[in-house]
Interface confidence: low
C-alpha cells in the first residue's frame, strides 16, 4: 500500500463489499513503518505510532509486524491488502477485531506478525497466551 | 491521537457571513473525505457539506438548504477545514460539527447564532 | 434526497432491557446505514456501520441488522450509559440522510 506521507487520493467512490454485502468503509490503521521499539517480555503493548492513516483501498487491514534479533526490535504498522501476501506470509487472521500477534518462522531473527480488521487496531498489539500459545514466555509489551 | 477541533462559530445577524475551522491531527488529513454535519438547537443531525481530496479534484456536495451560500474548503499544508457561510439566516442557527466523512471523529462542535 | 424514518421518536425503559429502533428508508439503500449514539452537549459516536459491522470499541451488546429498506438497532441489555438519543443514517448516496432520532430515557 502508499504509505501516509506519500501523496495518494483515497478512491472513497471504489464499492467494496463483504461476504454479506455490507459495504467496507476504507480502514483507519497505524501507519508508522518500521520503527525501533522496546516492545519486549508483556502481554500486550501499544505501538506508540501517531500517525493514523486512511487506507488507499477499502480492503485493505491493518497489520503489525514485530521483529527481534541479536541487534534491536523493531515495529511495523501499515495497511496491507489480505489478497495479497506480506513478508511472504498470508494474513489468515485479516478478519480478526484485534490484532493477535503470531510467530512466523524466519531464520535469525524471532519474527510475529498480526491482522485486523477494525479501526486502528494495530495500535494494540496482543501476545497474550489466552490468544497465542505458539510462545508461552512471551509476554505483553508496552512501549516507552 | 486523532483530534477534530472547530472554531469561529459566534453571533451573527441574518444576512452576515461566518467562517468556520476545523484543525485536524493525529491522521493523514490530506488522505481524509471531510464533512460538515450540523445539529439545530433540541433538534436533529443535519449533513451540511463535504469535501472530497485535493489530489481527486477537491470537489465538494452540498445540502440544498446552504446550496449557494456555503462553501467548503481545505488546507492540506495545515491540516485545517473551512466551512465559509455567507447569507446567514435564522434556521441556519446550530452546532456545527466537522467529521471525518462521517466516520468514527468527530469535533465537539462550534454554536453558530444567527439573530437581530 | 432519501428520507430516513425512525421509530420510536422515544422510548422509556429500564436497565437490563431489550431495547430494538427501526429506521426506515424512502428506497433501497443496500447496506449503507449507519447508528449513532448522541448524548447531551456531545457529538455523535458511531456504534454500527454497513448496517451491521460494530465500530471498533462499542460494548457486544449493541447490535445492526437489515438490508434494503428495513433496519434494526438492538441493544440487548441496556445499560445505564446507553440512555441517549440514537440516529440512522444512510450513505447509499448524496446527501448523506439522518432519521429524526429516537430517544430512550429511563422508565
Known amino acids: 500500500t502508499i504509505p501516509p506521507h506519500v501523496q495518494k487520493s483515497v478512491n472513497n467512490d471504489m464499492i467494496v463489499t463483504d461476504n454479506n454485502g455490507a459495504v467496507k468503509f476504507p480502514q483507519l490503521c497505524k501507519f508508522c513503518d518500521v520503527r525501533f521499539s522496546t516492545c519486549d517480555n508483556q502481554k500486550s503493548c501499544m505501538s506508540n505510532c501517531s500517525i493514523t492513516s486512511i487506507c488507499e483501498k477499502p480492503q485493505e487491514v491493518c497489520v503489525a509486524v514485530w521483529r527481534k534479533n541479536d541487534e534491536n526490535i523493531t515495529l511495523e504498522t501499515v495497511c496491507h491488502d489480505p489478497k495479497l501476501p506480506y513478508h511472504d506470509f498470508i494474513l489468515e487472521d485479516a478478519a480478526s477485531p484485534k490484532c493477535i500477534m503470531k510467530e512466523k518462522k524466519k531464520p535469525g531473527e524471532t519474527f510475529f506478525m498480526c491482522s485486523c480488521s477494525s479501526d486502528e487496531c494495530n495500535d494494540n498489539i496482543i501476545f497474550s497466551e489466552e490468544y497465542n500459545t505458539s510462545n508461552p514466555d512471551l509476554l505483553l509489551v508496552i512501549f516507552q | 491521537q486523532v483530534q477534530l477541533v472547530e472554531s469561529g462559530g459566534g453571533l451573527v445577524e441574518p444576512g452576515g457571513s461566518l467562517r468556520l475551522s476545523c484543525a485536524a491531527s493525529g491522521f493523514t488529513f490530506a488522505n481524509a473525505w471531510m464533512s460538515w454535519v450540523r445539529q439545530a438547537p433540541g433538534k436533529g443531525l443535519e449533513w451540511v457539506g463535504r469535501?472530497?481530496?485535493?489530489?481527486?479534484?477537491?470537489?465538494?456536495d452540498f445540502a440544498a438548504p446552504v446550496k449557494g451560500r456555503f462553501t467548503i474548503s481545505r488546507d492540506d499544508s495545515k491540516n485545517t477545514l473551512y466551512l465559509q457561510m455567507n447569507s446567514l439566516k435564522t434556521e441556519d442557527t446550530a452546532v456545527y460539527y466537522c467529521?471525518?466523512?462521517?466516520?468514527?471523529?468527530w469535533g465537539q462542535g462550534t454554536l453558530v447564532t444567527v439573530s437581530s | 434526497d432519501i428520507q430516513m424514518t425512525q421509530s420510536p421518536s422515544s422510548l422509556s425503559a429500564s436497565v437490563g432491557d431489550r431495547v430494538t429502533i427501526t429506521c426506515r428508508a424512502s428506497q433501497s439503500i443496500s447496506s449503507y446505514l449507519n447508528w449513532y449514539q448522541q448524548k447531551p452537549g456531545k457529538a455523535p459516536k458511531l456504534l454500527i456501520y454497513?448496517?451491521?459491522s460494530l465500530q471498533s470499541g462499542v460494548p457486544s451488546r449493541f447490535s445492526g441488522s437489515g438490508s434494503g429498506t428495513d433496519f434494526t438497532l438492538t441493544i440487548s441489555s441496556l445499560q445505564p450509559e446507553d440512555f441517549a438519543t440514537y440516529y440512522c443514517?444512510?450513505?447509499?448516496?448524496?446527501?448523506?440522510?439522518f432519521g429524526q432520532g429516537t430517544k430512550v430515557e429511563i422508565k
Open positions: 443514517q444512510q450513505s447509499y448516496s448524496t446527501p448523506p440522510t
Open positions: 469535501i472530497k481530496t485535493t489530489y481527486s479534484g477537491g470537489a465538494t
Open positions: 454497513a448496517a451491521s
Open positions: 467529521t471525518l466523512d462521517l466516520r468514527k471523529y
